[in-house]
Amino acid sequence: AMHVAQPAVVLASSRGIASFVCEYASPGKATEVRVTVLRQADSQVTEVCAATYMMGNELTFLDDSICTGTSSGNQVNLTIQGLRAMDTGLYICKVELMYPPPYYLGIGNGTQIYVIDPEPCPDSDF
């Protein structure tokens, strides 16, 4: 299996945005790569978002996706937006080298993203 590295822990910003780098050790010269972000919480795994991209090009997520990303060589910089405290969990980066064959699959150990909902602003007296 292909090795995929990602940070162990990331803290989302107060605006509910978390970014992390997913890096894969490519055993071949892939031209088309698929990156999937999976969320593991309470032993359940769900797909957060996925994108297919040509090496050297931007990642294209679906229009309604909460993810955006950029690629550089064997690194993918992923950003997940709109996170709330209930979205805290382990976010796993899955990388597939699709074309040309052979196919390679790598799954990272996951990035624990902590999301803290901001305190509501106290009423101001004027």
């Epitope: 031209t31 088309e32 297919t52 040509m54 699709m98 074309y99 040309p100 064959p101 052979p102 196919y103």
Partner: antibody, heavy 118, light 107 residues
Framework: EVQLVESGGGLVKPGGSLRLSCAAS????????MAWVRQAPGKGLEWVSF????????YYADTETGRFTISRDNAKNSLYLQMNSLRAEDTAVYYC???????????WGQGTTVTVSS | DIQMTQSPSSLSASVGDRVTITCRAS??????LNWYQQKPGKTVKLLIY???RLHSGVPSRFSGSGSGTDFTLTISSLQPEDVATYFC?????????FGGGTKVEIK
Amino acid sequence: EVQLVESGGGLVKPGGSLRLSCAASGFTFSDYGMAWVRQAPGKGLEWVSFISNLAYSVYYADTETGRFTISRDNAKNSLYLQMNSLRAEDTAVYYCARSGLPYAMDYWGQGTTVTVSS
Amino acid sequence: DIQMTQSPSSLSASVGDRVTITCRASQDISNYLNWYQQKPGKTVKLLIYYISRLHSGVPSRFSGSGSGTDFTLTISSLQPEDVATYFCQQGRMLPWTFGGGTKVEIK
């Protein structure tokens, strides 16, 4: 039910051109890579070309590079093969196939016959 | 290119017989070996992918085995409807290549 229906085959003179089409139904076309495979009369199967689901990746057999062009229109659920500079050895039944598993072709059309002859 | 050599090119067996078809790749193709069936005058159907996984709807009398360069398709009990030509295909490297085919007939 997955269905692939090829069309566009026929008789053409050497050096001529043809455009094959494949109409897909019964599955989400834009999720799958597609391939063309041909079979000369009384012969085995020969892979011709492949296009990935979003058309990012396109590949051809060496003998077809420069003469054939594979393309797809995901809005129309259609796959195409533009064949130029046709030769007698291109005479074959051309099958459209879905690449639903990495590098295996899980569903095939009935084929369309291309005959190159003067 | 990876060459795929199938044997035998044809065989004749009785209903109920165990039939074995072999496929040899010119280099290691890992588990990217698929088997297809083409009945006379019909289209091609995927039988087995990744060496041994049965495609949906394929009877369990069909099985695949092997590794690296040598692979086998087995029909445990030949049925009249199994009369067809069988092809192996490697998906390890482009161009994807097929074996020459094995024509199976009933005695």
